[in-house]
């Protein structure tokens, strides 16, 4: 296919940075100030993308390549290359449609993005919790309860030093 | 205004050699392929040898090992030395510009107006 399209397409070996110039007879030229092509054999050149109110430069914008943006502190990106910023939060909030709201009781948002998230069920994997959550932590699961049964202790002592011969008491 | 004027053709001797010049202006230089083409009397025009902007080359069969094309960006200038020079070598050489930088199958975008070489004893 590539050396079909190389003998039919007379533009195939321009290359990136170029467009294949039909107002001058199919010979190459450089993109224009603020465009660029990334691939060869382009017949014309993208006009670079411009990071402006909320957004900012990330990477300036170069004959071929398109300029980055990335947000301004206060925001973070989401979308497919940093199509949109969206205001952060504090950790312990979610984002609404009317703006940052506290976790409620029993969730919790480690993150300045996203939301807020249940805190772990302990007890379904029979453990019981050893440090309770927050709006910023989840919990956190300790033993099971039967492992801290009365004499019993989470913290398994080292062996006594036993003479040869000796078997367990 | 793309203009491409070849120099440097002249008479010579059998075995003698030969360097042809062409001048280049109006476009981006070294981003564009060129190439040189001849013209014998009563013959067709034909290739004789390409240059991609990369500097890879390539020449017609009749002329490989002894036709050295090659070009200086700076200048915007490309060259065809000449060597080995035969009677069948006798033509008018022009310098072309390549379309879309192509050098497999290059079909030509501008011509220049074609320097005379004339090898004969």
């Known amino acids: 296919f590539e050396r079909t399209r190389s003998l039919q397409d007379p533009c195939s070996n321009c290359p990136a940075g170029t467009f294949c110039d039909n107002n001058r007879n199919q010979i190459c030229s450089p993109c224009p100030p603020n465009s660029f092509s990334s691939a060869g054999g382009q017949r014309t050149c993208d006009i670079c993308r411009q990071c402006k109110g909320v957004f900012r430069t990330r990477k300036e914008c170069s004959s071929t390549s398109n300029a980055e943006c990335d947000c301004t502190p206060g925001f973070h990106c989401l979308g497919a290359g940093c199509s949109m910023c969206e205001q952060d939060c504090k950790q312990g909030q979610e984002l609404t449609k009317k703006g940052c709201k506290d976790c409620c009781f029993g969730t919790f948002n480690d993150q300045k993005r996203g939301i807020c998230r249940p805190w772990t069920n302990c007890s379904l994997d029979g453990k019981s919790v050893l440090v309770n959550g927050t709006k910023e932590r989840d919990v956190v699961c300790g033993p099971s309860p039967a492992d801290l049964s009365p004499g019993a202790s989470s913290v398994t002592p080292p062996a006594p030093a036993r003479e040869p011969g000796h078997s367990p008491q | 205004e793309v203009q491409l004027l070849e120099s440097g053709g002249g008479e010579v001797q059998p075995g003698g050699s030969l360097r042809l010049s062409c001048a280049a202006s109006?476009?981006?230089?070294?981003?564009?392929?060129m190439g040189w083409y001849r013209q014998a009397p009563g013959k067709r025009r034909e290739f004789v040898a390409a240059?991609?902007?990369?500097?890879?080359?390539v020449y017609a069969e009749s002329v490989k090992g002894r036709f050295t094309i090659s070009r200086d960006n700076a200048k915007n200038t490309v060259y065809l030395q000449m060597s080995s020079l035969r009677a069948e070598d006798t033509a008018v050489y022009y310098c072309?510009?390549?379309?879309?930088?192509?050098?497999?199958?290059?079909?030509?975008?501008?011509w220049g107006q074609g320097t005379l070489v004339t090898v004969k004893p």
């Open positions: 240059i991609y902007s990369g500097r890879n080359t």
């Open positions: 109006g476009f981006s230089f070294s981003i564009n392929a």
């Open positions: 072309g510009l390549l379309k879309g930088n192509r050098v497999v199958s290059p079909s030509v975008a501008y």
